[in-house]
Interface confidence: medium
Amino acid sequence: GLQDPCSNCPAGTFCDNNRNQICSPCPPNSFSSAGGQRTCDICRQCKGVFRTRKECSSTSNAECDCTPGFHCLGAGCSMCEQDCKQGQELTKKGCKDCCFGTFNDQKRGICRPWTNCSLDGKSVLVNGTKERDVVCGPSPADLSPGASSVTPPAPAREPGHSPQDIEGR
């Protein structure tokens, strides 16, 4: 059968039916990420609380993240949500401190329960705070007389920042 002439149009172009199906470059502020396209897609515009992480090109869409004070939520940073402080979570009434027994070591997300060391048969080496999980130590049995040498506990985790956390702090 006859080959579709549009299949020869590379990414960054579209098959222009108004011009005898020749390959025309995508107009400004539009792109086509694959060949053989009959239209170019409109570039995403990073406006408002969104800021441009990657500019749109003729072959790829723009990528957005969030302006200072906000962080990304959703696939492809579809929303920006306010930051809170470590030791807090965002509720409908604003940033609230983590309840006793829970922690949050980031500026986003929810407060999570402290690790229950006893479930692993271990003791609490360092108490938890609103900002940090507890650090579990060796099990009580390991500390009994005559036990073999104890491996020192792993250091407490540094506050994690996901790749979507904003820059410029």
Partner: antibody, heavy 118, light 107 residues
Framework: QVQLQESGPGLVKPSETLSLTCTVS????????VHWIRQPPGKGLEWIGV???????DYNPSLKSRVTISVDTSKNQFSLKLSSVTAADTAVYYC????????????WGQGTLVTVSS | DIQMTQSPSSLSASVGDRVTVTCRAS??????VAWYQQKPGKAPKALIY???YRDSGVPSRFSGSGSGTDFTLTISSVQPEDFATYYC?????????FGGGTKLEIK
Amino acid sequence: QVQLQESGPGLVKPSETLSLTCTVSGFSLISYGVHWIRQPPGKGLEWIGVIWSGGSTDYNPSLKSRVTISVDTSKNQFSLKLSSVTAADTAVYYCARNPLTATVMDYWGQGTLVTVSS
Amino acid sequence: DIQMTQSPSSLSASVGDRVTVTCRASQNVGTNVAWYQQKPGKAPKALIYSASYRDSGVPSRFSGSGSGTDFTLTISSVQPEDFATYYCQQYNSYPLTFGGGTKLEIK
């Protein structure tokens, strides 16, 4: 209609703490942040800091050790405290609203002049 | 900190003139730039955000453009009420910073 009104003493002595209040009306605090900005006489604008509706704050590093911004939602009031002031802190101080949908200071108070002098 | 350098610092124009104010950022700020108008003794007023979007109620003669480090505010036909000082501001990263201002005066 949307209104922001700064208030506080117009004269502060060196080494004391400058305290200003921004009383707002005509909009829901949960949907906005509030910035404080200052402008020395005859000069440009300097950003002091912001408090977002969730209660989190961000400050200009050049002032961070001296600044506290807080909110009393029951009174619809935002406060600015600047400690250990000097003559260089003499300025018109503005509060300005920032919607959570766009990083722009879309409404400003009329400003209040604070002079630091003994 | 990101420096925002405005030029010119002042300019004279007549009613009906087309006027352009430029702002250069010391590093890439994407399109995270706003423009404000300030009249003597008054608070600034938002004109443009995200480099090119007019704030609500701003006349269409005001337009903004640019991305990266170079930005422009254009008044297509200056009106008597437009004589004021104009400031650009970046909000790509903390601390938020303003340009030094451009004073638009009557010729």
